[in-house]
Amino acid sequence: ASTQSPSVFPLTRCCKNIPSNATSVTLGCLATGYFPEPVMVTWDTGSLNGTTMTLPATTLTLSGHYATISLLTVSGAWAKQMFTCRVAHTPSSTDWVDNKTFSVCSRDFTPPTVKILQSSCDGGGHFPPTIQLLCLVSGYTPGTINITWLEDGQVMDVDLSTASTTQEGELASTQSELTLSQKHWLSDRTYTCQVTYQGHTFEDSTKKCADSNPRGVSAYLSRPSPFDLFIRKSPTITCLVVDLAPSKGTVNLTWSRASGKPVNHSTRKEEKQRNGTLTVTSTLPVGTRDWIEGETYQCRVTHPHLPRALMRSTTKTSGPRAAPEVYAFATPEWPGSRDKRTLACLIQNFMPEDISVQWLHNEVQLPDARHSTTQPRKTKGSGFFVFSRLEVTRAEWEQKDEFICRAVHEAASPSQTVQRAVSVNPGLAGGSAQSQRAPDRVLCHSGQQQGLPRAAGGSVPHPRCHCGAGRADWPGPPELDVCVEEAEGEAPWTWTGLC
């Protein structure tokens, strides 16, 4: 092992555990983590007599380094006396010494909170000729504290006579002020208020913040939703600017097209957020044909608080196309929620990631607020998937027990949509293509070709799936078969996944 100097710790008792009539008391010093032997421990007992005992060094199991304890027993007026333990480790260097000065016992205390406040800029957002830093040391058990100001870690020569202490109930607070020239403050140095109390150090630091920019303005430009593009046939794109600091300067958003052709009239909205920042959105209608043919649209953002203009561009996603597979299923009844049921829709393996998901009931599209749909996530392969969740009520399914999950995607043919119906009570459902969920089986229609079920939405079932005859203990209509997986070594009725 290489040479290692010791860490030194004072060992004291709690004051409340020492009897008031005690004539002598023992305190200690721990030197640990050093290598090689030896360390030399000496004590400064001031005006008091004391006897010392240094215990033999022990080896720390994991590191192979050493630890030792030196004990000092003093008698007399020890309560007001400070003691210094001096540890020397000559293998580290001939003058290596660590001193720890402490009293016989430690009192329970509430440590201070240290916080630096700084004077504000003038009305124009500029720094005044001098900057005041105020160090607030608050909420500590009354006792001696020392305040030191540091500049980039170096002690500053500061008049601390201005520090003032107040007491509120059982706790005390102190404040100290530091005045800096504008030049010092702008030089980007770090200023620290360091407080020493009960042998511990507490501190807070500050420096000039980055210039008057907010927390990084961000700009985003969305593509039109497939629903707007293919169903409503009135696509729009939105330029979103977030985290702007509200100020007199306005955000300037300018739209353009890479082809140089004119753009439509855009609509703009500004919103003040709870965190005090401003969000600006500008929505631009685009031509369906222009978009499909690959036009690039650009949104240029300028603002007094932005170092440079930001430009965001958007165009039709390039790359391979794949239509979505859609699977819809109902969750089983849950104890205590007989009048509500959750429907789920898994839409997967589509490319590109732009997709719109809708739910329909009674041929009417349900409001978007009714369902919750995840953002597209990448599958293990090259496509994307989303989940959509819809809560339905008994009143709805008793009126008509058929809910449709519809995906709108550019690769879906013939009309850019794929949809699947799902029922809360599949046994009572009508005959449209459905993917139903039983407690541990998937139901398939019996109208199969070459012994294969017409699984969810006509997709090919898992190669190891087949449709077995309906079981007597399965309360379904006779025209439904049970799709089971032929898993080796398992009963043929075990279902372990969507077929």
């Epitope: 700009a219 240029r300 440079r308 930001l310 965001r312």
Partner: antibody, heavy 119, light 110 residues
Framework: QVQLVESGGGLVQPGGSLRLSCAAS????????MTWVRQAPGKGLEYVSI???????WYANWASGRFTISRDNSKNTVYLQIDSLRAEDTATYYC?????????????WGQGTLVTVSS | DIQMTQSPSSVSASVGDRVTITCQAS??????LAWYQQKPGQPPKLLIY???TLARGVPSRFSGSGSGTEYALTISSLQPEDFATYYC????????????FGGGTKVEIK
């Protein structure tokens, strides 16, 4: 065509000051954010400061306090004032124009002016 | 502040070689990554902006790619006039940034 011509460089003693100028022509200066970039001999490019079209400015952390960027659109000129010069400020200082549409980097650079700080 | 790390710092190649230079951002950036070419005694010249769009007059053998934190500049078939130093730049910072340039990659003749 777009032209940026820097001037004001030269030999200066440590602790001294310099004011670099950048004369712009061939485009409307007020439409562009402008940047100063420096390059020490044999070293890479180092961003110094930027001033946007509104006249607000930003500096690299190390440049705060000693460097001041400004612009006078009526004179088609951008300035960089450097105070308390140090040996490590020795570099070629380039005046550069940000692309108009933004987010796309610097499309035009001046030839640069050499600042040498030495006693 | 976002830091841009370029690698390698230098590369030796022959005319006709395919050369790829990478630039890594310390955090994800939107798309405003630019690439510059600089020859001795000259100012830098913009090659690529928006991480993949060729600047006017730049030969098609130069191409840019990448997203998020990883970006690359590729020269498909190195020409004699391509021996130079190349820099990437985070050109889209909407806030204070300390050094927006990568450290540079010198492409030398093998």
């Amino acid at each position: 065509q777009v032209q940026l011509v820097e001037s004001g460089g030269g030999l200066v003693q440590p602790g001294g000051s310099l004011r670099l100028s950048c004369a712009a022509s061939g485009f409307t200066l007020s439409n562009h954010d402008m940047t100063w970039v420096r390059q020490a001999p044999g070293k890479g490019l180092e961003y110094v400061s930027i001033i946007n079209t509104y006249g607000n400015h930003w500096y690299a952390n190390w440049a705060s306090g000693r460097f001041t960027i400004s612009r006078d659109n009526s004179k088609n000129t951008v300035y960089l004032q450097i105070d308390s010069l140090r040996a490590e400020d020795t570099a070629t200082y380039y005046c550069a124009r940000e692309t108009h549409h933004g987010s796309s980097g610097i499309d035009h650079w001046g030839q640069g002016t050499l600042v040498t700080v030495s006693s | 502040d976002i830091q841009m790390t370029q690698s390698p710092s230098s590369v030796s190649a022959s005319v006709g070689d395919r050369v790829t230079i990478t630039c890594q951002a310390s955090e994800s950036i939107y798309s405003g990554l630019a690439w510059y070419q600089q020859k001795p005694g000259q100012p830098p010249k913009l090659l690529i902006y928006d991480h993949r769009t060729l600047a006017r007059g730049v030969p098609s053998r130069f191409s840019g790619s990448g997203s998020g934190t990883e970006y690359a500049l590729t020269i498909s078939s190195l020409q004699p006039e391509d021996f130079a130093t190349y820099y990437c730049q985070h050109a889209d910072y909407a806030h204070h940034s300390d050094n927006v340039f990568g450290g540079g990659t010198k492409v030398e003749i093998k």
